[in-house]
């Protein structure tokens, strides 16, 4: 059957019927129930939630819902021994304790298993010793600190701020410098923004506050005792020595509060300058220890959470499609929380829940998509990806073979400003066409398509009149799907104004004070950017699964191509000397680069010409299509990363919430000339440029006729 | 047969603005970037903005950058050149080109005979 | 000021041989496609060479074009009063992410 006479309406009556049942107020219900007690992984809250999603998506009238459990390395605070730092004086005597708890927001006060901050996956220690602030512990941070202020942080204890890189990164960058404990804080800075009140009355972040989150350096391994493989009932297991990405030092989360206490005693070198102050009434000396009258005393650890294996759980529901089951479109989301999970999952969780809604309210009026979509709702996220990971292991094989794109559905908002958007260029013309067909949300943008406000209010830095669409990094569900399988990626969301809102992330970020009431009354209260979101997400999913041609440009990649070689290519040239010295040419990347160009156009001049009724080339070119994205995977992965496998894009490894273009060639050239041995180095430089150069040509060659 | 036509061209004083079109026709229109080509009189050649394949990414010359904007329509086969606070300098016969390649610049197979813009109080 | 440097006028009889040099730098000429145009009184230019040196169809062989380094060159044998024109050298330039073009060189066919 066509994908037409799978229903009783006509195709573009069936994305504008969907669209159409999206409603705010259901996304605000949803948002509601979701919220109301914390769903940690591993937690029986989390588990009847999950039963609870199982339920309504059955009744929603997806074709079959499951649960599939893994069972994982989470990590938890001792209920009885809790994380702490102390000063102590030079008799060892905690002349002050940091904060065992955030303050309950007011009506939460009786809430029970609120999980108290901490840094998950911290070993268990105790260690002690003078402080050393290290701004946000950043590459280049230590640089400043290590080769130009000579400053040693060698069996110090390190404070880092929160900010600008995933976390996970500063602590592997502090054990580098060979720090014996990390403590992250979050500076009003960055997570307080000028004018707005404190929650509860308004969105800023309080003294006690404190940010939780995983430090975990997995490079997309997924649960650390298994990489590679699913963590079912016969996985071999690792030992704990041998698990992959778990932090070797101490590690804990604070307040302002309580950083203000630890910082305003420091001694020692004076700040660099003004890009390592931030907001408190601290001097933001770097230290080593305290000043003068202080200097006896010392900062002390205490860490006694544990790592076990336990059990998570993801809800997969599938809608069949009525033309091409083999073929599918995922729409994923986590739905493990922190504490209440206001924003980070569950605006997003809600939203997925009412696309699966609309999309069961088609499917009982008798239509279906032309592709089978799967929705998922992951568990343990905030762990590591763990359940999305996990169950993408289980499923490579299908996954590799079928499946068409994935979209991620995390928080739908980080502010109420305009859209962001990070994908792979294939979609580029889906998502920018969707947006012109929306309506924006926006004020001053009445009657206005959602592409001319974003446009208006997010301008590419290199495109003008086109909106800024970013690289996939990492950080979230799609990483397995893009990074290591090569499956089509794209994530949407509502964001802030980067212009004038410096903070990072939004200030109540995996606090307990992520509440329903902090949407409700401050981001968003008529859910219209929710509404939104749903509608891109939805959309985006809706015309993956139902356009008879897939909606994919493949000349878009040849343009990002040809930026990205420029860019890498402009890199390597401040070193035109070792360039010559070592014969090191880019001629054949940009020679592959150009090939695909014109390889890309010719397809799609083909793409435009064939005879869509039939359908053996019909299939032939969506195939084409389909495996484009995975052309790009190179089977041996990325030096030292083996799950990140894309040659095109990776998580940066100085900070896996941003991506890179051609990550080989990039890191081989990343401080390059700091190398012992140069000549090994450039050496790399060449490597790295000929496997670029052949898997972009490789890539080409698929979208070449295929006799 | 490929064929570039381009319009628009004329008179305009100092400040004002014009809109270049260029009829593209013998060739599938979206799968190639095109430029627009300018030629002041008696001088050499000088490349002022391209529009790539598929979305259609923008790229300018610092020349133009912020005054002129380049824009295609796929469906209509067209190419245009918006610009504003013209000057003196941008006296010139303006060319459409096509690239050779596919979807950024890499060289131009064909040429329009050229329109020519007068900036002249 | 063009980026790219080329000789303002060569000249030389008919049936001789000449040559048009075209020079610029590691981020255009040496990385990027060189091409060449002619552009001949009162007509558009077009296209002579491309990817360094490579003929369009319809373009004799007494045209070619290489590239060494950061330099590329137009060669042109047994040379035509037809050939008397304005040619141009254009390659992308990968640090400007923009077109360049060399500022011309006018070919004068002597006799």
């Known amino acids: 059957k066509s994908s037409s006479e799978a229903t009783n309406i006509t195709p573009k009556h069936n994305m504008k019927a969907f669209l159409d049942e999206l409603k705010a107020e259901n996304i605000k219900k949803f948002l509601h129930n979701f919220t109301q007690i914390p769903h940690l992984a591993g937690t029986e809250q989390n588990f009847q939630l999950a039963k609870q999603i199982q339920s309504q998506w059955k009744e929603f009238g997806l074709d079959s819902v499951e649960l599939t459990h893994y069972d994982v390395l989470l990590s938890y605070p001792n209920k009885t021994h809790p994380n702490y730092i102390s000063i102590i004086n030079e008799d060892g005597n905690e002349i002050f304790n940091t904060s065992l708890f955030e303050p309950p927001p007011a009506g939460y006060e009786n809430v029970s298993d609120i999980v108290p901050p901490f840094s998950a996956f911290s070993p268990q220690g105790m260690p002690e010793g003078d402080l050393v602030y290290v701004n946000y512990a950043r590459t280049e941070d230590f640089f400043k600190l290590e080769r130009d202020m000579k400053i040693n942080c060698s069996g110090k204890i390190v404070i880092a701020r929160y900010g600008k890189v995933f976390r996970g990164n500063k602590v592997k960058n502090a054990q580098l410098a060979g720090a014996t404990g990390v403590i992250l804080y979050s500076d009003p800075d960055d997570y307080f923004a000028p004018g707005v009140k404190s929650y509860p009355d308004g969105w800023n972040l309080p003294g006690g506050g404190v940010q939780r989150g995983n430090i975990l350096n997995l490079n997309g391994a997924g649960d650390p005792l298994t990489p590679g493989y699913p963590a079912n009932e016969y996985a071999y297991r690792r030992g704990m020595a041998e698990a992959v990405g778990l932090p070797s030092i101490p590690v804990h989360p604070i307040g302002y509060y309580d950083a203000q206490k630890l910082l305003e005693k420091m001694g020692g070198s004076a700040s660099p300058d003004s890009s390592w102050r931030g907001s408190l009434k601290v001097p933001y000396n770097v230290g080593p220890g305290f000043t003068g009258n202080f200097s006896t005393q010392k900062v002390k650890m205490h860490i006694h959470s544990t790592s076990e294996v336990t059990r998570i759980y993801n809800v997969i529901g599938t809608l069949r499609g009525a033309v091409e089951p083999d073929r599918y479109v995922i729409l994923g989301g986590h739905r493990d929380s922190w504490v209440f999970g206001g924003i980070d999952p569950q605006s997003g969780a809600a939203v997925v829940h009412e696309i699966v809604r609309s999309f069961g309210m088609l499917k009982k009026e008798g239509w279906r998509p032309r592709r089978t979509i799967l929705f998922a709702s992951w568990d343990a996220e905030e762990f590591g990806l763990l359940g999305s990971t996990e169950w993408a292991e289980e499923n490579s094989r299908l996954l590799q073979e079928r499946g068409v794109a994935y979209i991620n559905a995390d928080s739908s908002i980080e502010g109420n400003y305009t859209l962001r958007v990070d994908c792979t260029p294939l979609m580029y013309s889906l998502v920018y066409n969707l947006t012109k067909e929306l309506e924006s949300p926006d004020e001053g943008f009445e009657g206005k398509s959602l592409y001319e406000s974003w446009t208006k209010k997010s301008p590419s830095p290199e495109f003008s009149g086109m909106p800024r669409i970013s690289k996939l990094g990492s950080g979230n569900d799609f990483e397995v799907f893009f990074q290591r399988l090569g499956i089509a990626s794209g994530r949407a969301r509502y964001t802030k104004n980067w212009e004038t809102n410096k903070f990072s992330s939004y200030p109540l970020y995996h606090s307990v004070y992520e509440t329903y009431e902090l949407v409700e009354k401050f981001y968003d209260p008529m859910f219209k950017y929710h509404l939104t979101v749903a509608q891109v997400r939805g959309g985006m999913v809706f015309e993956l699964a139902n356009s008879v041609v897939l909606p994919f440009d493949c000349r878009d990649y040849a343009v990002v191509l040809r930026k990205y070689a420029d860019k890498i290519y402009n890199i390597s040239m401040k070193h035109p000397q070792e360039m010559k010295t070592y014969s090191v040419s880019f001629d054949s990347l940009f020679s592959a680069v150009k090939n695909f160009t014109e390889i890309a156009s010719k397809f799609s001049e083909r793409l435009r010409d064939f005879d869509k009724s039939n359908p053996i080339l019909l299939r032939m070119m969506n195939d084409q299509l389909m495996f484009l994205e995975r052309a790009f995977i190179d089977p041996l992965g990325l030096p030292d990363r083996p799950f990140y496998r894309h040659v095109i894009y990776a998580p940066s490894s100085h900070n896996k919430y941003a991506g890179e273009s051609f990550p080989g060639i990039y890191d081989a050239l990343f401080d390059i000339e700091s190398k012992v041995d140069p000549s090994q180095a450039w050496g790399e430089v060449k490597r790295q440029i000929s496997i670029a150069t052949f898997t972009v040509q490789a890539a080409a060659e698929t979208l070449s006729e295929v006799a | 047969e490929v064929q570039l036509v381009e319009s628009g061209g004329g008179l305009v004083q100092p400040g004002g603005s014009l809109r270049l079109s260029c009829a593209a026709s013998?060739?599938?229109?979206?799968?190639?970037?095109m430029s627009w080509v300018r030629q002041a009189p008696g001088k050499g050649l000088e490349w002022v903005s391209a529009?790539?394949?598929?979305?259609?990414?923008?790229y300018y010359a610092d020349s133009v950058k912020g005054r002129f904007t380049i824009s295609r329509d796929n469906s209509k086969n067209t190419l245009w050149l918006q610009m504003n606070s013209l000057r003196a300098e941008d006296t010139a016969v303006y060319y459409c080109a096509k690239d050779g390649v596919g979807a950024t610049p890499y060289y131009f197979d064909y040429w329009g005979q050229g329109t020519l813009v007068t900036v002249s109080s | 000021q063009s980026v790219l440097t080329q000789p303002p006028s060569v000249s030389a009889a008919p049936g001789q041989k000449v040559t048009i040099s075209c020079s610029g730098s590691s981020s255009n000429i040496g990385i990027n496609y060189v091409s060449w145009y002619q552009q001949l009184p009162g007509t558009a230019p077009k296209l002579l060479i491309y990817d360094n040196n490579k003929r369009p169809s319809g373009i004799p062989d007494r045209f070619s074009g290489s590239k060494s380094g950061t330099s590329a060159t137009l060669g042109i044998t047994g040379l035509q009063t037809g050939d008397e024109a304005d040619y141009y050298c254009g390659t992308w330039d990968s640090s400007l992410s923009a077109v360049v073009f060399g500022g011309g060189t006018k070919l004068t066919v002597l006799g």
């Open positions: 013998g060739f599938t229109f979206s799968s190639y970037a």
């Open positions: 529009i790539s394949g598929g979305i259609g990414s923008t």
